[in-house]
């Protein structure tokens, strides 16, 4: 596991002639947002293809407003990296797309708007735990300066994260099986640990967390032996070295999607991610150009006219999809703090507070009691959001101002006659009854109708329930 | 510590059977995964076969199937490893190895599983 990190230098204007114009202007002032896709391996892929490795988006940048005149200078960025976790081995080989957006703060109906601005792509080897690499990439009039790194998240370490280290126990050996890491002498490499209850017997692991099964067994823990004793799925060049997976029958056995779709399940059934130029749940639907509107949620179309072209869409954040047909339930990653209640308003995630909570992400614990104050000796106790006064004996109400009556619920019963006490109250009983409120009748012979005794007690012995 | 000694090998001509042996001292393994693995002079060291303790799982590899054959005396704390149609590329030093606290990480037929290893005995196949 590790974070591929980038960071961008500048964007603006490239050397040469055909200087492009101010993204922004007097009547529209904007701000930029960058995201970066990453894939494994060289492949030249679509761009719309899945960012197997990860994706990431930027902060926004500081609004800026086009002076009139001048030329386009570099534009004002956005604070801090961009990072990309990645949680199984980093590939040594990737590719990469870094997309500059535009966001439009003037008067929309409905809020920002968003364009894209630029698109750049490439193909790079890097082994992760190196220095920084250094790159500029141009898209039309536009240039982009950036630097870009993988490092490895502890206790993974070397070029692919692949190797675990933890600091030695002792300083002259690692246990049993575990060698020094180099280039860090001083740790050893740590055991790896499978997913946990993956069978000892049945299952393995070459990632931490993952339980791939020998042949004939099947299930998430390699515990459900399977009826066939051959190996439906190989891995690598033989079962016997790697194992296998034996699946079971699944909502895209026979693959549903057409024209080349890629099927995937999900909870309830599947989805299909479709090819440039089809859509539709099983990408039955082709043909499609520009012209046809195919992008939903204020998608921005990008191809040709002619049904031979393919198109893109560009999609807002907050949607995603060969045609931003999907709304990225951005509330799942809970980012309210504090039970706060998530809105996705499309165009921006809100925080709805619970009292005594505030911030963009209810991330500030107000003070309940600050400021105040619970009167005739009362404290203050903080909590849920709303203060409460604990009042001292004889006081009550929200701040402990109103002198309280012990007697006012008329506490004793049957007929007895209730006097207020420093310590709380004092029942006087009618002739006949008895008890701290008066609740036992005496009976005649002189024994009580009391609750059962408890063990070791004697029914009729008054003195001890009093 | 663990001590796991192996015997059995030599030279033997293509077509014969060998036996080997592996006996593991001062700890008795009730479960886990023992196994063999060979290398052969300039090549990388290899699976052959690993043998479940307390379980029933066998597994070899590709170039053995059919022609070896594992097995373990519980009584003895040895693993035996019997090899049928020996041929010359059968030719190298073969290793026990024994995993004292079963956990599923690597493979069995990966040296990286195994935390103890013997010393290594040698089989020659040759006319």
């Known amino acids: 596991a590790g974070v591929f990190e980038l960071q961008i230098h500048s964007f603006g204007p490239g050397p040469g002639p055909g200087a492009p114009r101010s993204p922004c202007s007097a009547r529209l002032p904007c701000r930029l947002f960058f995201r970066v896709c990453l894939k494994p391996g060289l492949s030249e892929e679509a761009a719309e293809s899945p960012c197997a490795l990860g994706a990431a988006l930027s902060a926004r940048g500081p609004v800026y407003t086009e002076q009139p005149g001048a030329p386009a200078p570099d534009l004002p960025l956005p604070d801090g990296l961009l990072q990309v976790p990645f949680r199984d081995a980093w590939p040594g080989t990737f590719s990469f797309i870094i997309e500059t957006w535009r966001e439009e703060l003037g008067d929309q109906i409905g809020g920002p708007a968003w364009s894209l601005l630029a698109r750049v792509a490439g193909r790079r080897r890097l082994a992760a735990g190196g220095p920084w690499a250094r790159d500029i990439q141009r898209a039309g009039a536009w240039e982009l300066r950036f630097s870009y790194r993988a490092r490895c998240e502890p206790p993974a370490v070397g070029t692919a994260c692949t190797r675990l280290c933890r600091p030695r126990s002792a300083p002259s050996r690692c246990g049993p099986g575990l060698r020094p890491c180099a280039p860090l002498e001083d740790e050893c490499e740590a055991p790896l640990v499978c997913r946990a209850g993956c069978s000892p017997e049945h299952g393995f692991c070459e990632q931490p967390g993952e339980c791939r099964c020998l042949e004939g067994w099947t299930g998430p823990l390699c515990t459900v032996p399977v009826s066939t004793s051959s190996c439906l799925s190989p891995r690598g060049p033989s079962s016997a070295t790697t194992g296998c997976l034996v699946p079971g029958p699944g909502p895209c056995d026979g693959n549903p999607c057409a024209n080349g779709g890629s099927c995937s399940e999900t909870p309830r059934s599947f989805e299909c991610t479709c090819p440039r130029g089809f859509y539709g749940l099983r990408c039955e639907v082709s043909g499609v150009t520009c012209a046809d509107g195919p992008c939903f949620n204020g998608g921005l179309c990008v191809g040709g006219a002619d049904p031979d072209s393919a198109y893109i869409c560009h999609c807002p954040p907050g949607f995603q999809g060969s045609n931003c047909e999907k709304r990225v339930d951005r509330c799942s990653l809970q980012p309210c703090r504090n039970g706060g209640l998530c809105l996705d308003l499309g165009h921006a995630l809100r925080c709805r507070c619970r009292a005594g909570f505030a911030g963009p992400r209810c991330e500030h614990d107000l003070d309940d009691c600050a400021g105040r104050a619970c009167a005739n000796g009362g404290t203050c106790v903080e909590g849920g959001g709303a203060h409460r006064c604990s009042c001292a004996l004889g006081f009550g109400g929200r701040d402990c101002r109103e002198r309280a009556d012990p007697c006012a619920a008329r506490p004793c019963a049957h007929g007895g006659r209730c006097y207020a006490h420093f310590s709380g109250l004092v029942c006087a009983c009618a002739p006949g009854y008895m008890g701290a409120r008066c609740e036992f009748p005496v009976h005649p012979d002189g024994a009580s109708a009391l609750p059962a005794a408890p063990p070791g007690l004697r029914p009729g012995d008054p003195q001890r329930y009093l | 510590e663990v001590q796991l000694v192996e015997s059995g090998g030599g030279l033997v001509q293509p077509g014969g059977s060998l036996r080997l042996s592996c006996a593991a001292s001062?700890?008795?393994?009730?479960?886990?995964?023992m196994g063999w693995f060979r290398q052969a002079p300039g090549k990388e060291r290899e699976g052959v076969a690993a043998?479940?303790?307390?379980?029933?799982?066998?597994l070899y590899a590709d170039s053995v199937k059919g022609r070896f054959t594992i097995s373990r005396d519980n009584s003895k704390n040895t693993l035996y490893l019997q090899m049928n149609s020996l041929r010359a590329e059968d030719t190298a030093v073969y290793y026990c190895?024994?995993?004292?606290?079963?956990?599923?990480?690597?493979?069995?037929?990966?040296?990286?599983?195994?935390?103890?290893w013997g010393q290594g005995t040698l089989v020659t196949v040759s006319s």
């Open positions: 190895a024994a995993q004292l606290r079963p956990n599923a990480a690597y493979h069995p037929l990966d040296g990286r599983k195994y935390n103890y």
């Open positions: 001062t700890y008795t393994i009730s479960s886990g995964y």
């Open positions: 043998i479940y303790i307390g379980g029933s799982t066998t």
